[in-house]
C-alpha cells in the first residue's frame, strides 16, 4: 500500500515485478499491485481467501478516494452507504435506508417523510388550492334556457399536490341547484318534452339548494366529512332546504 509496506512486501516476495499491468507502479505475483502510478487509487480486492492490490482511476461503489502524500487509497464508506464523498457525507444509501443530512437512516425524523423514489427524507408537502373560479352559467341538460330548475358548478385548481403524508386536497368542484333564466329557447335549443316540463314549480326556497355532481362523486376519494348515508341526506334536505351545500371532488 504505502511506500514502507511496499518495501516489506518486496522483501517477503522476491518476485516483485516492475513490468506491471493496469496502472500498478510495483507489483508481485502473489499480492498484485503494491503501489500505483500517479493519480490512481490503491484498493484491495478479495479473490477467494486472498486479497489482491489493484490500481483504479476511481474507487468502486461503497468506497471513496483519499489522497495522502505516500498513497492514494480507496476507503470504505459507512456500512449503510452506497456512495459517499467521505465518511461524514453519504450521497446514496444502501437499499432500505433513507438519506438525510448526509447520513443513512432506517426511518425519517419527525416532520419528514420517506421518498421511496429518491430514497431520501424530504419535507412533508401539504395540498394547496387556488381560489374558487366564478360559478358557471345555470344549465339543465346543457341548456341555459327554457327550464326553471338547473345546476351551476364552480371549480378551483390544485396548485400543489400533497406528498404521501401531506394534508389531502379539499374539494375542487362544487355544484348547486339554481334557477335557469326565464327565456324562451330558440329553435334547436328546446329541451326534452314530457316529464321535466310537467313537473310542478319548486318552492321559492328551493332554487339554490346544492345537489351532488354525479361525475365529481364518481371520481372522488371521500374524506370523512363527505360521507353521508341516504337517510342523513333526506333529513338534511328537509331540515335545511335553503342552505347551499357542496358535494365535491377530492384529490
Amino acid at each position: 500500500q504505502n511506500a514502507s509496506r511496499g518495501r516489506r512486501q518486496r522483501r517477503m516476495h522476491p518476485n516483485v515485478s516492475q513490468g506491471c499491468q493496469g496502472g500498478c507502479a510495483t507489483c508481485s505475483d502473489y499480492n498484485g499491485c503494491l503501489s500505483c502510478k500517479p493519480r490512481l487509487f490503491f484498493a484491495l480486492e478479495r479473490i477467494g481467501m486472498k486479497q489482491i492490490g489493484v490500481c483504479l482511476s476511481s474507487c468502486p461503489s461503497g468506497y471513496y478516494g483519499t489522497r495522502y502524500p505516500d498513497i492514494n487509497k480507496c476507503t470504505k464508506c459507512k456500512a449503510d452507504c452506497d456512495t459517499c464523498f467521505n465518511k461524514n457525507f453519504c450521497t446514496k444509501c444502501k437499499s432500505g435506508f433513507y438519506l438525510h443530512l448526509g447520513k443513512c437512516l432506517d426511518n425519517c425524523p419527525e416532520g419528514l417523510e420517506a421518498n421511496n423514489h429518491t430514497m431520501e427524507c424530504v419535507s412533508i408537502v401539504h395540498c394547496e388550492v387556488s381560489e374558487w373560479n366564478p360559478w358557471s352559467p345555470c344549465t339543465k341538460k346543457g341548456k341555459t334556457c327554457g327550464f326553471k330548475r338547473g345546476t351551476e358548478t364552480r371549480v378551483r385548481e390544485i396548485i400543489q399536490h400533497p406528498s404521501a403524508k401531506g394534508n389531502l386536497c379539499p374539494p375542487t368542484n362544487e355544484t348547486r341547484k339554481c334557477t335557469v333564466q326565464r327565456k324562451k329557447c330558440q329553435k334547436g335549443e328546446r329541451g326534452k318534452k314530457g316529464r321535466e316540463r310537467k313537473r310542478k314549480k319548486p318552492n321559492k326556497g328551493e332554487s339554490k339548494e346544492a345537489i351532488p355532481d354525479s361525475k365529481s362523486l364518481e371520481s372522488s376519494k371521500e374524506i370523512p366529512e363527505q360521507r353521508e348515508n341516504k337517510q342523513q341526506q333526506k333529513k338534511r334536505k328537509v331540515q335545511d332546504k335553503q342552505k347551499s351545500v357542496s358535494v365535491s371532488t377530492v384529490h
Epitope: Y64, T66, R67, Y68, F85, N86, K87, N88
Partner: antibody, heavy 116, light 107 residues
Framework: EVQLVESGGGVVQPGRSLRLSCAAS????????MAWVRQAPGKGLEWVAT????????YYRDSVKGRFTISRDNSKNTLYLQMNSLRAEDTAVYYC?????????WGQGTMVTVSS | DIQMTQSPSSLSASVGDRVTITCRAS??????LAWYQQKPGKSPKLLIY???SLIHGVPSRFSGSGSGTDFTLTISSLQPEDFATYYC?????????FGQGTKLEIK
C-alpha cells in the same frame, strides 16, 4: 452531535514547548483521520498536521516537521499536538478538525502565543 | 505545494446583491475543491465540497462552479448572515492548502 474541544493553549517563550489536546465526542473517533489547522491573528487558515484513524501514519507541513508531533489516544477519544522549539511565527489559534479530504467538523480553537 | 489564490481579498456588497468570489489553483486540482465560511471569533464551517456539492443545511443561494484551476463561489442574493470571510481549499494534493480568504463586508 459532533463536539471537538481544544485545550492547552497559552503564552510561551520562544524555544519552549506546549502540548495541545482535543477531546472528541459524538462520533466514532477511531474511524476518523484527525488534523490540526492553525490561524495566525488576522490571517488565513493553514493546515499543520494529520494523523490517520489508527495512528499508524502522520503527515506535517514542512515548517513544523521535526518540531511538532501529532498523536492520538483512541481509547480516550483524544487528539494531541506536542509543540517543541516554538517560534514567534507559530503564534495562532489552533483548531482540531476531522480531516477526510475536507475539514468537516472543527473545534472552537485554542490560542497559542509565542512571545518573549 | 499547490498555491490557492483568491480574489478579491475583500469585497463590499449590500443585502440582495449577487456576489462572486474566485479561487485559482497553481496547478490542476480537478474537482477537489471545497469552500468554507468563517465569522469573526468562530471556527470555519464547510459549505461546499467537490466544487459544487452543497453541505446539507447550507442555503441554495450558495453555489460553486469551475474545474481544473479556476473556481468560483457565488451567493445569488446576499443575506445579512452571509457577511463573513470565505476560504477555498484544495484536497487533490498534500499539503492540503487554503486560499488567503475573501472578506465580505456590508457596503
Amino acid at each position: 452531535e459532533v463536539q471537538l474541544v481544544e485545550s492547552g493553549g497559552g503564552v510561551v517563550q520562544p524555544g519552549r514547548s506546549l502540548r495541545l489536546s482535543c477531546a472528541a465526542s459524538g462520533f466514532t473517533f477511531s474511524d476518523y483521520d484527525m488534523a490540526w489547522v492553525r490561524q495566525a491573528p488576522g490571517k488565513g487558515l493553514e493546515w499543520v498536521a494529520t494523523i490517520i484513524y489508527d495512528g499508524s501514519r502522520t503527515y506535517y507541513r514542512d515548517s513544523v516537521k521535526g518540531r511538532f508531533t501529532i498523536s492520538r489516544d483512541n481509547s480516550k477519544n483524544t487528539l494531541y499536538l506536542q509543540m517543541n522549539s516554538l517560534r514567534a511565527e507559530d503564534t495562532a489559534v489552533y483548531y482540531c478538525a476531522t480531516h477526510d479530504k475536507t475539514f468537516d467538523y472543527w473545534g472552537q480553537g485554542t490560542m497559542v502565543t509565542v512571545s518573549s | 505545494d499547490i498555491q490557492m489564490t483568491q480574489s478579491p481579498s475583500s469585497l463590499s456588497a449590500s443585502v440582495g446583491d449577487r456576489v462572486t468570489i474566485t479561487c485559482r489553483a497553481s496547478e490542476d486540482i480537478y474537482s477537489d475543491l471545497a469552500w468554507y465560511q468563517q465569522k469573526p471569533g468562530k471556527s470555519p464551517k464547510l459549505l461546499i465540497y467537490d466544487v459544487n456539492s452543497l453541505i446539507h443545511g447550507v442555503p441554495s443561494r450558495f453555489s460553486g462552479s469551475g474545474s481544473g484551476t479556476d473556481f468560483t463561489l457565488t451567493i445569488s442574493s446576499l443575506q445579512p448572515e452571509d457577511f463573513a470571510t470565505y476560504y477555498c481549499q484544495q484536497y487533490d494534493n498534500y499539503p492540503n492548502t487554503f486560499g488567503q480568504g475573501t472578506k465580505l463586508e456590508i457596503k
